[in-house]
Interface confidence: low
Amino acid sequence: AVNGTSQFTCFYNSRANISCVWSQDGALQDTSCQVHAWPDRRRWNQTCELLPVSQASWACNLILGAPDSQKLTTVDIVTLRVLCREGVRWRVMAIQDFKPFENLRLMAPISLQVVHVETHRCNISWEISQASHYFERHLEFEARTLSPGHTWEEAPLLTLKQKQEWICLETLTPDTQYEFQVRVKPLQGEFTTWSPWSQPLAFRTKPAALGKDT
């Protein structure tokens, strides 16, 4: 049996994946649940099995096709339903008319690499993954650098208000280990949110030259 309120949130990665999280206050006991996607004007539909991520929330990924295929566009509507099994029947627990390009969350940037490192600066590049060609250059990035003795949460955010897949970090300390992360967000979409942070890139600045005053 299901009681209590539920929250059903989904994001489109702009290509061929819709990720959903369903939270339910009441208890679900040994109940199988799934998300069903029914696009309004396309021949296909898709289902994924909700798997527990915490005591009261479940998640799944609707794989719509090959990772770089453009499966939905700005005028698509996808009816998303949470269905839970009750005996031999399926009960609709939540429903939403999902507008993919109003609910975007891109994949985390990939292929981070140090292009050039010096004593006080480091040039880093990255790539975006599975991002729709519809965005053209309408993307922004946030980056952060982890310094020794600090946490990621304490790291100041650097904002790049354009599609710029590199950054030059300045005023770094020589011969010091750092980590760097970046995330991306399209400018489009009322409920669009930041991608997950990229995998951290570790790098070390060069030591200061011997015999020089610092």
């Epitope: 029914w38 309004d40 004007r41 396309r42 021949r43 566009t73 700005t74 005028v75 509507i77 009816t79 429903i95 939403q96 008319d97």
Partner: antibody, heavy 119, light 106 residues
Framework: EVQLLESGGGLVQPGGSLRLSCAAS????????VHWIRQAPGKGLEWLGV???????DYNAAFISRLTISKDNSKNTVYFQMNSLRAEDTAVYYC?????????????WGQGTLVTVSS | DIQMTQSPSSLSASVGDRVTITCQAS?????MYWYQQRPGKAPRLLIY???NLASGVPSRFSGSGSGTSYTFTISSLQPEDIATYYC?????????FGQGTKVEIK
């Protein structure tokens, strides 16, 4: 067979309201969106809005302040209401549905219902 | 809104003639549709997704184009093709139609 049947047209006073019905058969309005399109006498086609399978709507911004599209899933019927009517709203009003495949346009149309706004 | 400009607004051609109608969009669109409307009737879908023939539509009808420029062709005009033809974009809301091209037989 997919069919759409509009009703509710007729003579309406300026400033009055209009409520049209679109009865769907051969498919469920819980699975497909239903659009409304109109055509003034001797003029072209104008898209007004749509109600999607889950109940959400998209409207032409030019009509958003006076247009409401709703539906009754149990009756498999979509409703179109427009307020503050004026003479230029005189038109044949159609409901339409897209086909099943990718972007296959308005494959199914009702026969249309004529609305005349006049005193 | 994306404006759709059809040309010509009307034309007269002989049976068997090749007839071409163009539709120019005010900005780039991804998908173009063409409809036929006979007097007193609802529109009928002829071409979807720029170049695909709708079910039951004769092969003398065809469509092509991309970006802002699209073309609709009747390869051999038949008496039953007397109608008004409309283009329509389905890339951005509001969905918009061309003003129509009236085709008559000489």
């Amino acid at each position: 067979e997919v069919q759409l049947l509009e009703s509710g047209g007729g003579l309406v006073q300026p400033g009055g309201s209009l409520r049209l019905s679109c009865a769907a058969s051969g498919f469920s309005v819980t699975s497909y969106g239903v659009h409304w399109i109109r055509q003034a006498p001797g003029k072209g086609l104008e898209w007004l809005g749509v109600i999607w399978s889950g109940g959400s709507t998209d409207y032409n911004a030019a009509f958003i302040s006076r247009l409401t599209i709703s539906k009754d899933n149990s009756k498999n019927t979509v409703y179109f209401q427009m307020n503050s009517l004026r003479a230029e709203d005189t038109a044949v009003y159609y409901c339409a549905r897209a086909g099943d495949a990718n972007y296959d346009g308005f494959a199914y149309w009702g026969q249309g219902t004529l609305v005349t706004v006049s005193s | 809104d994306i404006q759709m400009t059809q040309s010509p607004s009307s034309l007269s051609a002989s049976v068997g003639d090749r007839v071409t109608i163009t539709c120019q969009a005010s900005s780039s669109v991804s998908f173009m549709y063409w409809y036929q409307q006979r007097p007193g009737k609802a529109p009928r879908l002829l071409i979807y997704d720029t170049s695909n023939l709708a079910s039951g539509v004769p092969s003398r009808f065809s469509g092509s184009g991309s970006g802002t420029s699209y073309t609709f062709t009747i390869s051999s005009l038949q008496p039953e093709d007397i109608a008004t033809y409309y283009c329509q974009q389905w890339s951005t809301y509001p969905l918009t139609f061309g003003q129509g091209t009236k085709v008559e037989i000489k």
